[in-house]
Interface confidence: medium
């Protein structure tokens, strides 16, 4: 199937009758709560950083003659020393994540040889896009994080042809499609209705959406399941 | 002299100061960057390898196939005999999965189904040989000796291989090197 | 198990309205659209048009503009077709249907409610 | 609107045999094509959708081909189940419309 068969429309019912899912809707609290845990993340880490430049300005400022200027001068070193600590474990961080090593070294001399980079290594590309094949097993909320620390997000299905093949290699993983209640409609993590297909739809405790071997079906949120992360190319 | 000194310590603790300010800064805007790729979606920023990007083709699968490692893979969602999947893959260019090692569909691990691969019984060697020839190594299937000769293998990528009658209809998996 | 519940039947007086519900059951409306479909006696099919229960939004085939009007009421999870000025014409079977998914338009049918206008 | 025409408009067929039913659309649907069986006095049944996907749980011997303007439905050996009247629908634009039907009936 080519990906024309699903679209995210703007206006009304889908532009055209084989395209189906929705615009956003207005109630996309759960996600929004966890872009508020992330924006909250990202704010405190830059007040900590604020905090410690404020600090060591007023210490940096004011004139203390009973401190040795040798002392001063050491702290001042041993502070540059763990800044620069830090912006290289930023900057080096990330690339080591994305490009896990295998050990064995065979595969080493290969895979040097062959990853264009359009995926991190150990991923798996797919149709225009890198998918990464979890083996833990961790709550929706947990599955989400995961995936957004791996820059990337918790499984979202296309097509159904991407379901077919998402099934036949891994059939039972969370999806991104979630809702807030039984008496919600079914969202996905980008805040689109999701219309298609979900088994065991009417238990309410169930409701969180997860891969399964027929197809989607309901879950609860807190259950530990496979979790895949996806990104597009 | 002391003057002096005093001075000299006092310049290396202000570059010291300018430099901690400067490295703070960066931080400040590492952190900043690297939460901002938080969002639920971001753009995927591809790693350093940008000589091999330019050719994007270099390690690229056909659609609907899947890119693992160094090669590419066809997963069947229907089923063929032995024979059809044979000369389905062929018409690929590619070949039924010839395993390298017991890992090698890792990510395809909680997959339930078996899979036809490429290895058969070749009588004149009396030996189970891949595809190219290649013989089978004892260590990928222990059970390997209890294979009957006439049959198939069909593959499950939890590490199982069970030998069936090659006219049985079974999922299959072509396989293509990438290099 | 997925089911939508209609009226078998309706009898009705010319010029007069009528409104046809379509209960679900197994599924929660707000979770698909909802289509109806008029089979007039031994007559083919046609589309009315549709309605996307989460948020009211319809849409309806010319030939129907003005003549139905699609609402749904998720709190009892029914969606409904009311017809108005009736003539002999609206003699049909009125088929609720429900969209399955990805590209299957119609999965699952209701049984029909058969409008007869007659004086 | 998009005009779906269908033939035959009724035929004759024997137990085995192989039967085809085709849809000829006014204009490219992109194979937004589902067929449907109705029996009398029954709702319709979707057998196969986007052209050729055979909807979970109809019978094999049911396929679907075609793309641009031209489809068709095959029932590869005719089973006496298989009588009843067979629809097309374009779902490519709005407003869907169907095809007149074909009534299948035993020779």
């Known amino acids: 199937m080519d990906n024309q068969g699903v679209i995210y429309s703007d206006l009304n019912l889908p532009p055209n009758p084989k395209r189906k899912q929705q615009k956003p809707k207005g109630n996309t609290s759960s996600i929004l709560v966890t872009e508020q845990e992330i924006t909250y993340v990202e704010l405190n880490l830059q007040k900590t950083s604020q905090d410690f430049q404020g600090n060591y300005k007023t210490n940096h400022c004011k004139d203390l003659p009973s401190v040795p200027e040798k002392l001063i001068a050491g702290i001042l070193g041993i502070i540059c020393l763990i800044l620069m600590a830090s912006v290289v474990t930023i900057v080096v961080i990330p690339s080591t994540l994305t490009q896990k090593h295998n050990n064995s070294s065979l595969n080493t001399r290969t895979q040097k040889a062959c990853h264009c980079g359009h995926c991190p290594e150990e991923w798996i590309t797919y149709s225009n896009s890198c998918y990464y094949i979890g083996k833990e097993k961790r709550t929706w909320a947990e599955s989400l994080l995961a995936c957004t620390l791996k820059n990337s997000s918790l499984l979202s299905i296309d097509n159904e042809e991407e379901m077919k093949f998402l099934t036949a290699i891994s059939p039972s993983t969370w999806t991104g499609v979630f809702r807030d209640s039984s008496q919600h409609p079914w969202v996905t993590i980008n805040g689109l209705t999701f219309k298609h297909e979900i088994k065991d739809s009417d238990n309410a405790e169930h409701n969180c959406a997860m891969l399964h071997a027929r197809g989607l079906k309901s879950d609860r949120c807190g259950s530990s399941k496979i979790y895949h992360c996806k990104h597009k190319l | 002299m002391a003057v002096f000194k005093t001075t000299l310590w006092r310049l290396i603790s202000g570059t010291l100061g300018i430099i901690c300010l400067s490295l703070m800064a960066t931080l400040g805007i590492l952190l900043k960057n690297s939460f901002t790729k938080l969002s639920v979606e971001p753009a995927y920023t591809p790693g350093p390898n940008i000589e091999l990007q330019k050719d994007s083709d270099c390690c690229s699968c056909h659609e609907k196939w899947v890119g693992y490692r160094c090669n590419c893979y066809f997963i069947s969602s229907e089923e063929k005999t032995w024979n059809e999947s044979r000369h389905f893959c062929a018409s690929q260019k590619s070949s039924l999965l010839q395993l390298q090692n017991r890992d090698e569909l890792d990510f395809m691990s909680s997959s339930q189904h078996f899979y036809w691969i490429g290895l058969s019984y070749s009588e004149e060697h009396t030996a189970w040989l891949w595809e190219n020839g290649s013989a089978l190594s004892q260590y990928l299937f222990p059970s390997f000796e209890t294979f009957k000769p006439k049959n198939c293998i069909a593959y499950n990528s939890k590490g199982n291989a069970l030998d069936e009658s090659c006219e049985t209809k079974n999922r299959y998996i072509c396989k293509q090197q990438l290099i | 198990e997925v089911q939508l519940q209609q009226s078998v039947a309706e009898l009705v007086r010319p010029g007069a309205s009528v409104k046809l519900s379509c209960t679900a059951s197994?599924?929660?409306?707000?979770?698909?659209?909802i289509d109806w479909v008029k089979q007039r006696p031994e007559q083919g099919l046609e589309w009315i048009g549709n309605?996307?229960?989460?948020?009211?939004?319809?849409k309806y085939a010319p030939k129907f503009q003005g003549k139905a009007t699609i609402t749904a009421d998720t709190s009892s999870n029914t969606a409904y077709v009311q017809l108005s000025s009736l003539t002999s014409e609206d003699t049909a079977i009125y088929y609720c249907a429900r969209w399955g998914g990805w590209d299957v338009r119609f999965a699952y049918w209701g049984q029909g409610t058969l409008v007869t206008v007659s004086a | 609107d998009i005009k779906m025409t269908q033939s035959p408009s009724s035929m004759y067929a024997s137990l085995g045999e192989r039967v085809t039913i085709t849809c000829k659309a006014s204009q490219d649907i992109n194979t937004y094509l589902s067929w449907f069986q109705q029996k009398p006095g029954k709702s319709p049944k979707t057998l196969i959708y986007r052209a050729n996907r055979l909807v979970d749980g109809v019978p094999s011997r049911f396929s679907g081909s075609g793309s641009g303007q031209n489809y068709s439905l095959t029932i590869s050996s005719l089973e006496y189940e298989d009588m009843g009247i067979y629809y097309c629908l374009q779902y490519d634009e709005f407003p869907l419309t169907f095809g007149a039907g074909t009534k299948l009936e035993l020779k």
């Open positions: 197994g599924f929660n409306i707000k979770n698909t659209y």
């Open positions: 309605i996307d229960p989460a948020n009211g939004n319809t």
